[in-house]
């Protein structure tokens, strides 16, 4: 029959070439002379000339060695024609399968593979995967089946088998306990890929395993005891820098220190922060320290890391003895602002109050006093006793110096320290009102018509406070009551002035006496301009002139 079974040809054949493979034969050759030919890739199309056929015998010839990795199968067509060129058979399919030889070594996809694993992990933890390829066949043969192995490990600490590799997948895993970044930060593994499933050709590569840091080391104080000296009252003062060592990776959260004052800071006087570069703990004063109250503080500071510990670790504690240094402190008025009630208008030389300061220092320092600011010059202060006396008339109604009944004075105390220090106090004199002002009408000039005059309403003011004000009483004096009447309204805060008799146009003095609720009397002269007019007027009309 005009058929041929698939032909298997090993790659890399050594010849001699041409090499006979198989014979094409048509049974029509009994009737006529047959000529054979082949077509297809590898015969008459690229790659041309790999195969040929003996025209008259039909022998299929291989002209050169084959490479399975280049072409694994050839599909050709065999043809049979008679002498006159007429086709005597249908084209026949010829399959030539190139069988594999183990002519390629495995190749790793990288010369160096890099992976990482956290220190202290358990065996079984995967680290990384390496890959090697082999161009040979791995389906029908083991020629291209790669098996992975670890050839060597550097360093060999804590022992030489810290890792293993999955022989088929190339996954590297931890096999032993004891990965410690602080001892061995990196391992270099020489890995092998061997074809024939481990029995063939071998190639090597390098796998570098970085051991990642875990917070398995606590920061430790070095030293653990400190002594510091701090002047009293200093706020934000650097007391001490505390130093720690930590074996974990520098500048990582497992290395960065977090400080906590565990004890000894009952008054919340101190604070501690971490220096971003040195990792030191910077102990500073949050509040001023008081030498006289407590001249020594013993602080206990604990250090941990920003990152939590991965296992139970003992924490390190430092002891800091802070000696408070005495400074000459300023005297302090007690209270810093003193309110004193005093009647206005007290006689000169009359005592107002005693205002003294205390010196925080333990030594019996002498304190002297003086007035620093006394806007009206009403007061004097005894330099030894702090006695404040009146030297001027205290006037509650003085709007230049008194605000809301309060006269403000600043006083100074000075100790005899070296150098001397001063403190100030504020004396707030609340001036108690006395009835030293009579009522005053407003306005004090009026214009009124002498015919059908309009009543003039005058407002009454009194600089004093109640009860030294309304209700007011009015009285006309010096014969003013002949032409005028004066009446206080019901509320008692205005006076109504009325013209009761005709007066010729002119200017007149109306003598009005007003008294307040405390009978303080005030005589005021009202200038009344009387005009020749009817009813309401603001200014007298001029004389009429004809045209």
């Amino acid at each position: 029959d005009w058929v041929v079974a698939p032909i298997s040809v090993p790659e890399n054949g050594k010849g001699p070439f041409p090499q006979r493979l198989n014979q094409l034969k048509s049974n029509k050759d009994r009737d006529t002379k047959i000529f054979y030919s082949i077509t297809g890739p590898g015969a008459d199309s690229p790659p041309e000339g790999v195969f040929a056929v003996e025209k008259e015998t039909g022998w299929l010839l291989l002209n050169k060695p084959l490479d399975r990795e280049e072409i694994a199968k050839y599909e050709l067509f065999g043809h049979a024609v008679s002498e006159n060129g007429a086709s005597v058979e249908d084209p026949m399919n010829i399959s030539i399968i190139v069988t594999d030889q183990n002519d390629h070594k495995p190749k790793f996809t990288q010369d160096t593979f890099r992976g990482s694993v956290l220190e202290g992990v358990l065996p079984g933890t995967s680290v990384m995967q390496v890959t090697a390829t082999d161009e040979d066949d791995a389906i029908y043969t083991y020629n291209g089946v790669v098996a992975y192995s670890i050839h060597s490990q550097e360093p060999k600490d804590p022992h030489d088998l810290m890792f293993t590799i999955h022989r088929s997948t190339g996954t590297i895993s931890v096999i032993s306990s004891g990965l410690d970044r602080e001892k061995v930060p990196e391992y270099t593994l020489t890995i092998q890929a061997t074809d024939m499933d481990g029995d063939g050709s071998t190639t090597t590569a390098v796998a570098v395993v970085e051991i990642l840091d875990a917070n398995d080391n606590a920061p430790m104080f070095d030293p653990q005891k400190y002594e510091a000296h701090v002047p009293e009252n200093a706020v934000g003062h650097e007391v001490q820098r505390l130093t720690v060592t930590d074996l974990d990776a520098p500048n990582s959260p497992a290395w960065r220190a977090t400080y906590l004052i565990m004890g000894g800071d009952d008054g919340d006087h101190f604070t501690i922060t971490t220096h971003p570069e040195s990792n030191q703990g910077i102990l500073t004063t949050r509040k001023g320290l008081d030498f006289e109250a407590k001249n020594q503080h013993t602080l206990y500071v604990e250090v941990t890391n920003e990152a939590p510990f991965v296992l139970k670790l003992p924490t390190s504690t430092a002891t800091i003895v802070v000696h408070v240094e005495d400074v000459n402190e300023a005297p302090v008025f007690v209270p810093p602002s003193k309110v004193v009630e005093v009647q206005e208008g007290i006689p000169t030389g009359e005592p107002v109050c005693v205002y003294t300061a205390e010196d925080p220092d333990k030594e019996n320092q002498k304190i002297s006093y003086r007035i620093l600011r006394d806007p009206a010059g009403w007061l004097a202060m005894d330099p030894d006793s702090g006695q404040v006396t009146a030297v001027g008339t205290l006037d509650r109604e003085d709007e230049q110096f008194v605000r809301n009944n309060i006269y403000e004075v600043m006083v100074l105390a000075m100790d005899n320290g070296s150098p001397p220090t001063t403190g100030t106090g504020t004396l707030l004199l609340t001036l108690i009102d006395v009835n030293d002002h009579g009522p005053v009408p407003e306005p004090r000039q009026i214009t009124i018509c002498n015919q059908s005059p309009v009543r003039q309403v005058l407002n009454i003011t009194d600089k004093d406070l109640s009860p030294h004000t309304s209700p007011f009483q009015a009285q006309l004096t010096d014969d003013s009551d002949i032409y005028w009447t004066a009446e206080v309204n019901e509320e008692g805060d205005t006076v109504v002035l009325s013209l009761k008799k005709f007066l010729k146009q002119d200017t007149y003095d109306v003598h009005l006496s007003l008294s307040d609720h405390g009978n303080k009397e005030q005589l005021t002269v009202i200038r009344a301009t009387v005009c020749d007019c009817h009813g309401h007027v603001e200014t007298c009309p001029g004389p009429w002139k004809g045209g």
Epitope: E119, V121, L122, S126, L161, H166, R167, S177, A214
Partner: antibody, heavy 117, light 111 residues
């Protein structure tokens, strides 16, 4: 000579708790991962839990996850297994074992845990 | 159901040789050369007798040997003795959080 000595076993009611200890000597305890392996009466070995040498990494079998806690104190050379919400199927001899390179090298003599009402 | 499969029992006469198989998968026995064997006498703790397929710890008789082919490991005991009667467990390393797999155990009876 390497020695591992378990203690803490006993009879406990279902839902109860026990804490097993394993005192180690004769080797550098902190360098070794440690496991608890149990063996129910007449049955085979079942791995229960493991902890790394530093104590920073732990594994648990699915059957005990969420109920058992493994821990160690390297300063005392002691391994622990805290067992909560105990069930009848947790009844077994519990062994502690040190992990070498690819195998459990040394085993304790075991401590019996019986969960029964 | 154990991760590694062992025959439930084997037996042999004194002086004979026996072999116990331990079958796993390509991700445990087949993937790593970390198969170990443990001997356990009744009421006693397991004892390591072979590690890394065929390595004997000191003090273990050279009558015990190990091998591996594909996904199956084997323990061979030659010149059987009465004291060899015990349960034998195989174990394999595997990657992941169940890093250690045990076989179901094989009871060896010395006839």
């Amino acid at each position: 000579e390497v020695q591992l000595l378990e203690s803490g076993g006993g009879l406990v009611q279902p839902g109860g708790s026990l804490r097993l200890s394993c005192a180690a000597s004769g080797f550098t305890f902190s360098s070794y991962a440690m496991s608890w392996v149990r063996q129910a009466p007449g049955k085979g070995l079942e791995w229960v839990s493991a902890i790394s040498g530093s104590g920073g990494s732990t594994y648990y079998a699915d059957s005990v996850k969420g109920r058992f806690t493994i821990s160690r104190d390297n300063s005392k050379n002691t391994l622990y297994l805290q067992m909560n919400s105990l069930r009848a199927e947790d009844t077994a001899v519990y062994y502690c074992a040190s992990w070498g390179t690819g195998q459990h090298e040394n085993w304790g003599q075991g401590t019996m845990v019986t969960v029964s009402s | 159901q154990s991760a590694l499969t062992q025959p439930a029992s084997v037996s042999g006469s004194p002086g004979q040789s026996i072999t116990i198989s331990c079958t796993g998968t390509s991700n445990d026995v087949g993937a790593y050369n970390y198969v170990s064997w443990y001997q356990q006498h009744p009421g006693k703790a397991p004892k390591l007798i072979l590690s890394e397929v065929n390595k004997r710890p000191s003090g273990v008789s050279n009558r015990f040997s190990g091998s591996k082919s594909g996904n199956t490991a084997s323990l061979s005991i030659s010149g059987l003795q009465a004291e060899d009667e015990a349960d034998y467990y195989c174990s394999s390393f595997t990657s992941g959080s169940t890093f250690n797999l045990f076989g179901g155990g094989t009871k060896l009876t010395v006839l």
